[in-house]
Amino acid sequence: IVLRPPRVHNSEENTMRALTLKDILNGTFSYKTFFPNWISGQEYLHQSADNNIVLYNIETGQSYTILSNRTMKSVNASNYGLSPDRQFVYLESDYSKLWRYSYTATYYIYDLSNGEFVRGNELPRPIQYLCWSPVGSKLAYVYQNNIYLKQRPGDPPFQITFNGRENKIFNGIPDWVYEEEMLATKYALWWSPNGKFLAYAEFNDTDIPVIAYSYYGDEQYPRTINIPYPKAGAKNPFVRIFIIDTTYPAYVGPQEVPVPAMIASSDYYFSWLTWVTDERVCLQWLKRVQNVSVLSICDFREDWQTWDCPKTQEHIEESRTGWAGGFFVSTPVFSYDAISYYKIFSDKDGYKHIHYIKDTVENAIQITSGKWEAINIFRVTQDSLFYSSNEFEDYPGRRNIYRISIGSYPPSKKCVTCHLRKERCQYYTASFSDYAKYYALVCYGPGIPISTLHDGRTDQEIKILEENKELENALKNIQLPKEEIKKLEVDEITLWYKMILPPQFDRSKKYPLLIQVYGGPCSQSVRSVFAVNWISYLASKEGMVIALVDGRGTAFQGDKLLYAVYRKLGVYEVEDQITAVRKFIEMGFIDEKRIAIWGWSYGGYVSSLALASGTGLFKCGIAVAPVSSWEYYASVYTERFMGLPTKDDNLEHYKNSTVMARAEYFRNVDYLLIHGTADDNVHFQNSAQIAKALVNAQVDFQAMWYSDQNHGLSGLSTNHLYTHMTHFLKQCFSLSD
């Protein structure tokens, strides 16, 4: 199926031009999405093009500026947050990025009633995290790893924790590994629905080994960055969950929530917290060997002022074929009875589906079923459940939004998005207002992205929020590559692939092939989304065919494919890329002497192993910030898929699956190895070890490092990186500059 819908036809073919590398580096063809900042059932905030904060009322059709760009500019604010009582706004400035999600900032509180900034008892700086209570205008914030509470913005703060210490004890914010691999947030505190209680995590990193690397900066001496970072098999952070009554915080102080006995008996993780009511909270825990997860529902005991988690309210989720969950263990969405919930987990056929759990997991009612997967539950109301899946027309790389009417029997299912803009839109997400009165649909492709507003009762489209008209006009004279998504059936495995073809593609000709690979567990590269990026340029201007293949270990096609790589990373992912390449050669339009592979992060690991596979298929390849040994990567991620690097567990495969072990096999390929020296995630150590092994084996290779750059290689490094990789590929494919 051809994915990119035909655009406005231009009769003057000579006015059409190919994409340039400059187009990509300048972000000329980037798109916009519109996610309403919902503040009620029918109102949302949005930052206008001129930086005013505007409140829109869908029902009255009125809008007004609640915060002017002048006020924003007065403190150089780049972000804002309205208090639920609409009396105050926090303004965020001096943004300073830390890790993937975390950053510090300076916060100012603006009083909307008098049009002035709150003076007296100002917030300290820099703050690590700040948020309003869900009701009223209480503030919780984290400063120097401790949590503080303000009843009102102008009040003096109440200090909740006192033991916070840099790189040792983290309160209300995650340490490195929890941020990156478990919570995927910058915060680790959660208000109860009406703001009565505040729950928070305390992470003790005292005994965790530290990764230290040089940050060269501009000074005479480099400084050393130290991060408590547990690598596979190392000592992990110790986590505790506390809850404090924010009305009378000094009364009994923070109360610890007990850990389920079956979890506490060995190393464990806390995976998420979901408030159900002000006096009921749901915690999810995970054994260090991540195939057992326990969901624990805890109730506040007024008489003792403690939290009780009865064993009858513990629900166990266990995988016998792999790890628990997909990338993460799914989180529950509670129904109106405040005890039963909806949750996505594997059904008996090994597909992730929505289940309804009341008393026990064994008695769960399966809500969705089929040889496809439910991906996200967006919202549950009294009569509807909204979720996304890849069911429609059996394309795993699509996302449509569905509504199940749960208020009647039998529950009927309706696809809300399947036929809205079928050619243009096959990959959606959604954002719902309170009680799902209204919702925004954000379509990511395969055509030009579009965001629309809908009535939550009738699903009628109310208005277009963003349709990227400028982008559409800019693309009218661009020769974009053609894209197709198809599948290969190989040995009872379905390999979905996306092929990006030059604009004047002719099947009777031969083209160089570039494989772009990620291939990490529970990832998906073959998606029906719009993108004008580096590989689009390589196809459009340089005449390459680019292919992306989802092999074993990838997501949303059932557990058989997903868990195939369990305890065996680096084997089947590579095999499946190679198998696909052989199939592409059979198609007749690939020049088998000009095949390359490249990937970043996990993709750098797979591309390295593919180059070192000894098949002779690849002429050259690039690895950007690759993992080279699973012993060097984070415990939480690595052990989920590989178990422990111990003799009685999986040490043998840890050793067998390194890139270094295959150094000799790089002799007959051109290899470009790239890494940032300040990569906090996949440490420079990984590439240093590859380089050392290649040198020791006397194998020639090319390398590039990016000083003081992290895993993202952002800013000017991005331009340098893509320019450098382009030269490398053109040289490999004997394409003239």
């Epitope: 009865p310 309210q313 109106y336 009875d337 405040a338 039963s340 009341k358 009612i365 208020g407 029997y409």
Partner: antibody, heavy 122, light 107 residues
Framework: EVQLLESGGGLVQPGGSLKLSCAAS????????MSWVRQAPGKGLEWIGE????????NYTPSLKDKFIISRDNAKNTLYLQMTKVRPEDTALYYC???????????????WGQGTTVTVSS | ELVMTQSPASLSASVGETVTITCRAS??????LAWYQQKQGKSPQLLVY???TLADGVPSRFSGSGSGTQYSLKINSLQPEDFGSYYC?????????FGGGTKLEIK
């Protein structure tokens, strides 16, 4: 008008078998959860078991699990209770009851039949 | 299996009085509770579900309340037709057991 009509009761010897039926009318039987409940003479109500609309879920009270079988035929609008290995203590008035779907995913016993009497005696 | 303990087993009251029947579960049933009325020689009739929601056609003098393990059925201003037996039943987890019943008689 909703009607549930039990039949098949009578005198049965200990160790014997009996099949009770419950004919439904006046509502969409194929969308209702159905249950059997019994009441021994002068005693309270005892829940026997339930069956969901498409027969994919059938639950019993543990003590009766191995001797009673609940089934349904949606085409015939009929619910069944197969009783085996009966004992004198199974003597009771047997009711079938039908339930509305209630959010979220459970039912209540809104409609009851008039009951059929089973006497177990030698 | 959850045990439902109903009290009192019997009580006598006069027309116009208010009575309360209680039901205690051996574990939390999270409001998944129904109340039934059964008159002599008749089938039971649903009065209340979800612990406090009145079934269709049930007079407003009946009301259900409670949470966790403790629930009650209150009848305000007793009418002659209210006399009979009352049963609670939980719907939390199978088996859906009944309470032992409360016999309400005319004083």
């Amino acid at each position: 008008e909703v009607q549930l009509l039990e039949s098949g009761g009578g005198l049965v010897q200990p160790g014997g078998s009996l099949k009770l039926s419950c004919a439904a009318s006046g509502f969409d039987f194929s969308t209702y959860w159905m249950s059997w409940v019994r009441q021994a003479p002068g005693k309270g109500l005892e829940w026997i078991g339930e069956i969901n609309p498409d027969s994919s879920t059938i639950n019993y009270t543990p003590s009766l699990k191995d001797k009673f079988i609940i089934s349904r035929d949606n085409a015939k609008n009929t619910l069944y209770l197969q009783m085996t290995k009966v004992r004198p203590e199974d003597t009771a008035l047997y009711y079938c009851a039908g339930g509305y779907y209630r959010y979220p995913y459970y039912y209540t016993m809104d409609y009851w039949g008039q009951g059929t009497t089973v006497t177990v005696s030698s | 299996e959850l045990v439902m303990t109903q009290s009192p087993a019997s009580l006598s009251a006069s027309v116009g009085e208010t009575v309360t029947i209680t039901c205690r579960a051996s574990g939390s049933i999270h409001n998944y509770l129904a109340w039934y009325q059964q008159k002599q020689g008749k089938s039971p009739q649903l009065l209340v579900y979800n612990a406090k929601t009145l079934a269709d056609g049930v007079p407003s003098r009946f009301s259900g309340s409670g949470s966790g393990t403790q629930y009650s059925l209150k009848i305000n201003s007793l009418q002659p037709e209210d006399f009979g037996s009352y049963y609670c039943q939980h719907f939390w987890s199978t088996p859906y057991t009944f309470g032992g019943g409360t016999k309400l008689e005319i004083k």
